[in-house]
């Protein structure tokens, strides 16, 4: 990019550059029309009467350099051929010299700085490539010369350009003073500011465009060359922020539209909102869940929103004494998640209707919560108690939902407790045909023992037809009609209002061989 410091083609007023010395044959300003019929200013000099060695100087106004270190001067000029000049002397030249002088302000006058090389700095002696020829009575013909010179390095606030004629017949048609700069650039979401090169190449730090963030260290940089061009190299280091996607050939980060989102820094595009979510605003890094839908903390932003599951279905129970097995079916609605678990809560309800959490002696297998299979075994149920079990299905968002999770209840009432097994049977008397047995009264938990049932059979005779039963209301019994000298296996069970308890261990007893030993007391 070229930044103009002075362009005489664009000047609408007199240039009024300074000439030296104040004598005839000096540079003079003319006005004319360019190709577009716009008014333009030029300077002419053609002093064929001048004494040898006398130079004519023309100096521009003070030009602020505006940070430029090297300034370029494009000069358009025509030069008369010495041979075609009628009064041309031997001192006629077809060249001119360009100088510059630096200063911190517009301090030059008609006499200062001294009109000579040093203080003026010589740039170049310019020779015409094309000469203009003029024949008597005819218009001058010849091509315009264009020469671009490089001034610098410059360090002061501004400068003057000066032209020295030492015998040329020429016209300075236009002067364009400019410097080269790298124009601002946006590439790969990185903004590089307009930069005036101070050296052959200058590193320029870039900054991320709006709504982009740095993704690398150090910050992205690009080199501005002296010719005002950016060095071609790959620029990386900026990516669009969450909620924004690259657009317009990686020049801007555009906000994600309604109904779309982008969750992380990066070059990805905005995506439609996942199921059960929405984004009402532009530039959303995340889509918000619909009412009743949630994301677990561990769920990525790109995952759908989910809801807690419905209650488990068809809870069935199998009661076996103090052990209960509950089984159920999976809920109809999983909530859109796969991390389904179950939890079982137990409450003990009194006849009056008040319920309390179940006691601590109850155990759950494999546990009361985090169940992945649809069953649980519960041990330690007390007899004659109504329990309410609530089976709930849970998933990763159940804790985020307001209100308790839906559950399926089941009521289970345990049987009243039967007496314990009768053991410690003693034979108090035996005879060849009878046995008198006694036992300790068992401690029945729910009411007194009403009666007992004695089960006995001869040892070795195991079939159902050989087993005999005897009921007694006391804790003793006489077994009659037994075989002499035979062995019998005896079991006793007690009955309370809750029913019969279990038979105790088999007790081994033997009848006598003869009467003499009859009624002999013996211990079991």
């Amino acid at each position: 990019l070229e930044e103009t410091l002075l362009n005489t083609k664009l000047e609408t007023a007199d240039l009024k550059w300074v000439t030296y010395p104040q004598a005839e044959g000096q540079w003079e300003e003319l006005s004319g029309l360019d190709e577009e019929q716009h008014s333009v200013r030029t300077y002419e000099v053609c002093d064929m009467k001048r004494p040898g060695g006398q130079a004519h100087w023309l100096r521009t106004g003070w030009v602020p350099r505006r940070g430029a270190v090297h300034v370029y001067a494009t000069i358009r000029f025509t030069m008369m051929e010495c041979l075609s000049l009628p009064r041309a002397s031997r001192s006629c030249k077809e060249t001119f010299t360009v100088f510059y002088y630096e200063s911190e302000a517009d301090t030059a006058t008609a006499h200062t700085p001294a009109w000579m090389e040093n203080p003026y700095i010589k740039v170049d002696t310019v020779a015409a490539e094309h000469l203009t020829r003029k024949r008597p009575g005819a218009e001058a013909t010849g091509k315009v010369n264009i020469k671009t010179l490089r001034l610098g390095p410059l360090s002061k606030a501004g400068f003057y350009l000066a032209f020295q004629d030492q015998g040329a017949c020429m016209a300075l048609l236009s002067l364009h003073l400019f410097y080269k700069k790298c124009s601002w650039l946006i590439t790969n979401l990185t903004y590089f500011p307009e930069t005036v090169p101070r050296e052959l190449v200058v590193p320029v730090a870039g900054s991320c465009v709006a709504n982009a963030v740095p993704t690398a260290n150090p910050s992205p940089s690009l080199y501005c060359r002296e010719d005002g061009q950016w060095a071609e190299q790959q620029v990386t280091g900026c990516s669009c922020a969450p909620g924004y996607e690259a657009a317009e050939s990686n020049k801007v980060c555009r906000a994600c539209g309604q109904g779309t989102f982008k969750p992380q820094i990066g070059d990805e595009s905005c995506l439609p909102c996942p199921a059960n979510s929405h984004s009402n605003n532009i530039g959303s890094p995340v889509c918000l869940c619909r009412i009743g839908y949630y994301r677990a903390r561990s769920d990525p932003r790109s995952s759908p929103c989910t809801t807690p599951p419905s209650a488990p279905r068809s809870v069935v129970h199998h009661l076996n004494g103090s052990t209960l097995r509950l089984e159920w079916s999976a809920p109809l609605e999983s909530g859109g998640r796969e991390d389904l678990t179950y939890a079982v809560r137990c409450r003990e309800c009194r006849p009056g209707g008040s319920c309390l959490p179940c006691g601590g002696d109850m155990t759950f297998d494999p546990g009361p919560r985090d169940l992945v299979e649809p069953w649980v075994a519960i041990r330690g149920l007390r007899p004659d108690v109504t329990y309410t079990f609530e089976v709930a299905a849970l998933n990763g968002v159940s804790t985020l939902a307001t209100g308790p999770p839906p559950f399926e209840p089941v009521n289970v009432t345990t049987d009243r407790e039967v007496p314990p097994a009768v053991s410690d049977i003693r034979v108090t008397r035996s005879s060849p045909s009878s046995l008198i047995l006694s036992w300790a009264i068992p401690r029945a938990p729910s009411g007194a023992v009403l009666d007992y049932e004695v089960k006995y059979h001869e040892k070795g005779a195991e079939g159902p037809s050989s087993v005999r039963f005897l009921k007694t209301s006391e804790n003793r019994a006489e077994l009659r009609g037994l075989k002499r000298g035979a062995s019998y296996l005896v079991q006793v069970r007690a009955r309370s209002e809750a029913g019969y308890g279990p038979f105790g261990q088999e007790h081994h007893s033997q009848t006598q061989l003869d009467e003499s030993e009859s009624w002999r007391e013996q211990l079991a």
Partner: antibody, heavy 126, light 109 residues
């Protein structure tokens, strides 16, 4: 010798027309930018119109725009001013004047008048 | 367009210095030319480009221009210098020409 000679002045009624001529001699007319300048009796100088050497561009003072036309015939070394819709306030001595010439490029001219004619009187009266 | 203002008259004794002013906004940024017109004659260029003298014009004529004022100076004024003097400049369009109202220089005695 280098000179400009105007002609064509005279008495004309308001609304009438007149054509002034300026004959150039002694210099390369076809390289020169030319102008007309007028001077009302007892008043100062007033620029009227310009024409470039090749007639590529003409300019007029606001007071005469649309009524006066400047032209030239380089083959005859003559400058013209066609005056139409004349008014009493157009009464003046009309001078033709040459702009300072470029050494060799007729596309350019200096901004001063370095050669004047003796003038011709135009009187607009009924 | 720029307006150029001149004093209607200036008087000077022979041999003295006469100064005729011409003022206008930022006139110093424009080139000013001066014309001498004697009664019944055509104008003659006496100073151009602020301070340059055409060949044939006596050295006693000089000019300057800065700020808002251009000045024509006649050193050692002579009786033959008695005339009307007009300043002139191009307007910013560079194609229209403006003249000052003119100053009558009277050489006393």
């Amino acid at each position: 010798q280098v000179q400009l000679v105007e002609s064509g002045g005279g008495l004309v009624q308001p609304g009438g027309s007149l054509r002034l001529s300026c004959a150039a001699s002694g210099f390369t007319f076809n390289n020169s930018w030319m102008s007309w300048v007028r001077q009302a009796p007892g008043k100062g100088l007033e620029w009227v119109s310009n024409i470039t050497s090749s007639s590529s561009m003409t300019h007029y003072a606001d007071s005469v725009k649309g009524r006066f036309t400047i032209s030239r015939d380089n083959s005859k070394n003559t400058l013209y001013l066609q005056m139409n819709s004349l008014r009493a306030e157009d009464t003046a001595v009309y001078y033709c004047a040459r702009k300072g010439m470029s050494f060799y490029n007729n596309k350019y001219a200096k901004s001063m008048f370095d050669l004047w004619g003796q003038g011709t009187l135009v009187t607009v009266s009924s | 367009d720029i307006e150029l203002t001149q004093p209607p008259s200036v008087s000077v004794a022979p041999g003295q210095t006469a100064r005729i002013s011409c003022s206008g906004d930022n006139l110093g940024k424009k080139y000013v030319h001066w014309y001498q017109q004697k009664p019944g004659q055509a104008p003659v260029l006496v100073i151009y480009y602020d301070s340059k003298r055409p060949s044939g014009i006596p050295e006693r004529f000089s000019g300057s221009n800065s700020g808002n004022t251009a000045t024509l100076t006649i050193s050692g004024t002579q009786a033959e210098d008695e005339a009307d003097y007009y300043c002139s400049a191009w307007t910013t369009t560079m194609m229209h020409i403006v003249f000052g109202g003119g100053t009558k220089l009277t050489v006393l005695g």
